[in-house]
């Protein structure tokens, strides 16, 4: 944010940029939290914008059996690996594919036993206030449907009729990760020291980060024809003086009509 | 690139033999899996019989002790030795093949295909 200075105040100007504010030549160059001409009003918004979408990653265990271990499959860079990357990624894309967070698996490592595949299963949301409860219940289908597989797609004699075969018993989730978004947190940390009086609304399920002085949220504060202004010690009115009156009060709702004051003052004298 | 030709299909009376053989180009002979699978009018394709690079076989119920898998890994071919023939045998013949060891009769579990052969058992 910033505000162009013109004529001989600028050099006055520039000593007096406030707030961490710094003086390019022509104007104060604001920090993010700060406005005006020097720099002195505090925002009354701050962009928090979500991220569009929200991931979560999965670590998990399967023991393919219907495929014996070589000694190539180690190498990521093989033709065997890439052969058999291509077969589980199809198995597991059929196994997930009515979950719609689901987009893909990541193999880590294959090793010994028959074929134990470790790998991470990727999930995303697109982002709304609901997300984790979004990906806690993904998480769990996933966690259903590779329970299911492994039990159902089984060798019989040694022979495999299904794409992939599994062992029922070799099914593990190591772990969950998902991406942290907080708006609050976020809020409260970019407001700085006016962190106490910032909160969180939401419009269309995004989030916004907003002082009283914003108008048009449930928090805004009613200045009437007064300006509010954000200080260390919370928002507060500033009134106005009109060609006709005087305004006071905390929200700058009480006017005092000028001519009575003077026709007092006159009564006086 | 793998490619995959067979030949040796053709027609055949109930009761005789056929030889099929596939020929394999740009595939690591000596690894992985080779099978044959078939496919009749109107079904599904069907496991046949499957080789892994140790010489390991498994057949389809319906074609032990009729069928034979055998692989030459020096001429990097795949063959397919066909007795007692039945009309239930009519069918187009597949040559597949992976660079992984498979214990699997289903074929997407297969990259490599060939175009296939007919065989018809008809009287």
């Known amino acids: 944010r910033t505000t162009t200075c013109f004529g001989d105040g600028c050099q006055n100007t520039a000593s007096r940029c406030k707030n961490g504010g710094t003086w390019d030549g022509l104007k104060c160059q604001c920090p993010n939290l700060y406005y005006g001409e020097l720099c002195e009003e505090v925002v009354s918004s701050i962009d928090i914008g979500p991220p569009e979408t929200i991931s979560a990653q999965m670590e998990l265990t399967v023991t393919v059996t219907s495929v014996k271990f070589t000694e190539e499959l180690k190498n990521h860079s093989s033709q065997e690996f890439q052969e058999f990357k291509q077969t589980f990624t199809e198995q597991m894309n059929i196994v997930y594919s009515g979950i719609p967070e689901y987009v893909g698996v990541n193999i880590t490592k294959l090793r010994l036993g028959s074929v134990v595949v470790e790998h991470d299963v990727l999930l995303r949301t697109k982002y709304t206030p609901e997300y984790k409860t979004v990906l806690d219940n993904a998480t769990e289908v996933v966690k259903e449907k590779i329970t299911k597989v492994t039990t159902q797609q089984i060798m019989i004699n040694d022979i495999c009729s299904d794409m992939m075969c599994f062992n029922t018993t070799g099914t593990q989730v190591q772990n969950i990760t998902v991406t942290q978004y907080d708006p609050e947190e976020d809020c409260r940390k970019m407001a700085k020291e006016y962190g106490d009086y910032f909160v969180v609304e939401y419009r269309d399920q995004k989030p916004y980060c907003i002082s009283p002085c914003e108008p048009g949220f449930s928090v805004s504060k009613n200045c009437n024809l007064g300006k509010c202004q954000m200080s260390l010690s919370g928002p507060q009115c500033l009134c106005v003086t009109t060609e006709t009156h005087w305004y006071s009060g905390e929200t700058c709702n009480q006017g005092t009509q000028k001519s009575l004051v003077y026709g007092h003052h006159h009564h006086h004298h | 690139d793998v490619q995959l030709v067979e030949s040796g299909g053709g027609l055949v009376q109930p009761g005789g033999s056929l030889r099929l053989s596939c020929a394999a180009s740009g595939f690591p002979s000596s690894r992985g899996t080779m099978a044959w699978f078939r496919q009749a009018p109107g079904k599904e394709r069907e496991g046949v019989a499957f080789i892994n690079s140790d010489g390991r076989t498994s057949y389809a119920e319906s074609v032990k002790g009729r069928f034979t898998i055998s692989r030459d890994n020096a001429l990097s071919s795949l063959y397919l030795q066909m007795n007692s023939l039945r009309a239930e045998d009519t069918a187009v013949y597949y040559c597949?093949?992976?660079?992984?060891?498979?214990?699997?009769?289903?074929?997407?579990?297969?990259?490599?295909w060939g175009q296939g052969t007919m065989v018809t058992v008809s009287s």
């Open positions: 597949a093949a992976s660079l992984l060891y498979l214990m699997t009769v289903n074929a997407a579990a297969y990259p490599y």
